[in-house]
């Protein structure tokens, strides 16, 4: 595959359940997959009473929902678990919530996760 400017090679890795899953807690994940398929980064988090709790971050397999997204933005209105994906190495380091609402203007809640 020809490397495009936004091809994902590495993603921020985080796993809140690292002990149960027997993984690292934080780090950088190298993304593997079929050579001709696109790779992405993702972030999942919860908003508990206004406090952001990261669930997982890492690599995400070829997904048209993530194509050409340089920023990791959740657009679904009030999901139970927030999810965003993006293209470009480490693009999941920052993630945001911009709910898509028809009438009102969306408000940005950018999040820069701090190591717990």
């Amino acid at each position: 595959a020809i490397l495009g400017r936004s091809e994902t090679q590495e993603c921020i890795f985080y796993n809140a359940n690292w002990e149960r899953d027997r993984t690292n807690r934080t780090g950088v994940e190298s993304c593997y997959g079929d050579k001709d398929k696109r790779r992405h980064c993702f972030a999942t988090w919860k908003n508990i009473s206004g406090s952001i709790e990261i669930v997982k971050q890492g690599c995400w397999l070829d997904d048209i929902n993530c194509y050409d997204r340089t920023d990791c933005i959740e657009k679904k209105d009030s999901p139970e678990v927030y999810f965003c994906c993006c293209e470009g190495s480490m693009c999941n380091e920052r993630f945001s919530y911009f709910p898509e609402m028809e009438v009102t203007q969306p408000t940005s809640n950018p999040v820069t996760p701090k190591p717990p």
């Epitope: 993702f42 997982k56 890492g58 397999l61 048209i64 678990v81």
Partner: antibody
């Protein structure tokens, strides 16, 4: 290598429920979707629904809305599809498949609904 | 989302080429490059052959190719071989905001 291994064949009574499992290996389970597809005897493929394995977010085909529940257990890398209020027309082979492109498939689980 | 439309059957002799069509609407096949093609032999699970309209899945022979014109996607198999005899289904990407749908399937007979 990527593998999706499904649970064994089931025989169910009309009105009951069935829960089919799909255990993934050979890749990071939380890095994609799991889709569920069924195929009635001699018929074509029918999409039932999908789950984002990391967030648990689901989407279901309108036809199955309210009757199907797809879940994922990340600790065991296993997805589940439960279909309730079974009727004879639900007799089919049920498949799980990885990702939005359905690039790897389970071997299929035959569910027979008969009184 | 309504099912995609495929011919019930097509046939060809060894060495020939055949094309299977998959017709949708301007809101699915026509506007997005997310149509896939699957091969299914009797009693087996389907196998992804082409994804994203024209990208060949790894390990799939280059005799298989995909294309799209308007609201119709097509799978072309050139240099037909006996082992190509199978059912072929078109389908769409499914996940996130996209809902899946399949065509009714096309039985390919190699004469």
């Amino acid at each position: 290598q990527v593998q999706l291994v499904q649970s064994g064949a089931e025989v169910k009574k009309p009105g009951s429920s069935v829960k089919v499992s799909c255990k993934a290996s050979g890749y990071t389970f939380t890095s994609s979707y799991i889709n569920w597809v069924r195929q009635a005897p001699g018929q074509g493929l029918e999409w039932m629904g999908t789950i984002n394995a990391v967030s648990g977010s689901t989407s279901y085909a309108q036809k199955f809305q309210g009757r199907v529940t797809i879940t994922a257990d990340t600790s065991t890398s296993t997805a589940y599809m439960e279909l309730s209020s079974l009727r004879s027309e639900d007799t089919a082979v049920y498949y799980c498949a990885r990702g939005g492109w359905f690039d790897y498939w389970g071997q299929g689980t035959l569910v027979t609904v008969s009184s | 989302q309504s099912a995609l439309t495929q011919p019930r059957s097509v046939s060809g002799s060894p060495g020939q080429s055949v094309t299977i069509s998959c017709t949708g609407t301007s809101s699915d096949v026509g506007s997005k490059n997310y149509v896939n093609w699957y091969q299914q032999h009797p009693g087996k699970a389907p196998k992804l052959m082409i994804y994203g309209v024209s990208k060949r899945e790894s390990g799939v022979p280059d005799r298989f190719s995909g294309s799209k014109s308007g609201n119709t996607a097509s799978l072309t198999i050139s240099g037909l071989q006996a082992e190509d005899e199978a059912d072929y289904y078109c389908g769409t990407f499914a996940g996130g905001k996209y809902y899946g749908v399949f065509g009714g399937g096309t039985k390919l007979t190699v004469l």
